[in-house]
């Protein structure tokens, strides 16, 4: 169910309208909804959520984290800087997203509406960023490269890339879920 | 099972600092979405959060004592350290870690130490 | 700040009586309202999360709900152990605040 269509809010006609915040966190915490179903099917289906040799596809890897510098966390928080550095990382989740397309079999529907509702959510932002021209969007040609590079991996590193995109990008959401709180 | 212990001294004079250590077991201080904060309850009254730290080392500290506290964690020993600066006896009270996880950032504490008086 | 403000300070009921506690906030928290028990002597423990989701091993007599500024923690059929004193607590933004209590006497 999309965020702002649940029951709660059916049963609750005297609620005002969700404020642009109650939106973005309503958004966020239904995408990681969608993050902790595909973990599931992909921690079922390999053993990839207890192997210690991650660090052998993340160097393959360069998935957006949150940093010191990046203004989101308390000590140094910056509301503007923060701001572009969670669309920036968002925008550059989006490849990797696309490669989780095809690797589901039971969560199929539910990866496509993890990836949608990141569009949706990188649309909320955008309304309340005010620095657009900070906002530095991925080349399509490098994506499409990318794309290619990873789904021409081993099967055992498609599964482990699968697990950290979705570890990484559920860590990163956290933490913007956490920041635009203190906005 | 989740486990908090807290540590540390339980008589301090005026103007020393209060070093207190929170050793957990049952959980990792590196997954995401997992924090520990302190909360402090002089005897027969409210509960007052201190400082939190998460996964990341992101911190939080309570604006009327931030310039008091600071707060660590060393996630190889499973520990988490509140030093607290020129102690007054107002700070007397029951000083508790506590655990925060879960994937939507609820802030709620859902394992408490048992807790140490401090006077 | 968020302020929270927890009505009423105290209140005494019977074995088997239902109890409604308030919690408001001076600010919307969206549902980030969580609630604690504690007994004397004893530290806090979670009973509610996130407005009305009960925590595991909490029992079904305890019902969170409420959203925005206004909560409520109702306890039906009360029993001996729920004696003690109920806290609310801000979990929308730091700095995280804890309402003053409720003291329930059974």
């Known amino acids: 169910v999309p965020p702002g269509e649940d029951s709660k809010d059916v049963a609750a006609p005297h609620r005002q309208p969700l404020t642009s915040s109650e939106r973005i966190d309503k958004q966020i915490r239904y995408i990681l909804d969608g993050i902790s179903a595909l973990r599931k099917e992909t921690c079922n289906k390999s053993n990839m959520c207890e192997s210690s040799k991650e660090a052998l596809a993340e160097n393959n890897l360069n998935l957006p984290k949150m940093a010191e510098k990046d203004g989101c966390f308390q000590s140094g928080f910056n509301e503007e800087t923060c701001l572009v550095k969670i669309i920036t990382g968002l925008l550059e989740f989006e490849v990797y997203l696309e490669y989780l397309q095809n690797r589901f079999e039971s969560s199929e529907e539910q990866a496509r509406a993890v990836q949608m509702s990141t569009k949706v959510l990188i649309q909320f932002l955008q309304k309340k960023a005010k620095n657009l021209d900070a906002i530095t969007t991925p080349d399509p040609t490098t994506n499409a490269s990318l794309l290619t590079k990873l789904q021409a991996q081993n099967q055992w590193l498609q599964d482990m890339t699968t697990h950290l995109i979705l570890r990484s990008f559920k860590e990163f959401l956290q933490s913007s879920l956490r920041a635009l709180r203190q906005m | 099972q989740v486990t908090l212990k807290e540590s540390g001294p339980t008589l301090v004079k005026p103007t020393q600092t209060l070093t207190l250590t929170c050793s957990f077991s049952g959980f990792s201080l590196s997954t995401s979405g997992v924090g520990v904060g302190w909360v402090r309850q002089p005897p027969g009254k409210a509960l007052e959060w201190l400082a939190f730290?998460?996964?990341?080392?992101?911190?939080y500290y309570s604006p009327s004592l931030e310039s008091r506290l600071t707060i660590t964690k060393d996630t190889s020993k499973n520990q988490v350290v509140l030093t607290m600066t020129n102690m007054d006896p107002v700070d007397t009270a029951t000083y508790y870690c506590?655990?925060?996880?879960?994937?939507?950032?609820?802030?709620?504490?859902?394992?408490w130490g048992q807790g140490t008086l401090v006077t | 700040d968020i302020q929270m403000t927890q009505s009423p300070s105290s209140l005494s009921a019977f074995v088997g009586d239902g109890v409604t506690m308030t919690c408001w906030a001076s600010q919307s928290i969206n549902d980030y309202l969580n609630w604690y028990h504690q007994r004397p002597g004893e530290a806090p423990e979670l009973l509610v999360f996130a407005a009305s989701n009960l925590q595991i091993g909490v029992p079904s007599r305890f019902r969170g709900s409420g959203s925005e500024t206004y909560f409520t923690l109702t306890i039906n059929s009360l029993q001996p152990e729920d004696s003690g004193t109920y806290f609310c607590?801000?979990?929308?933004?730091?700095?995280?605040?804890f309402g003053g209590g409720t003291k329930l006497e059974i």
């Open positions: 607590q801000n979990g929308w933004s730091f700095p995280l605040t």
């Open positions: 506590a655990r925060s996880a879960d994937d939507y950032l609820y802030y709620s504490f859902d394992t």
């Open positions: 730290i998460w996964w990341d080392d992101d911190k």
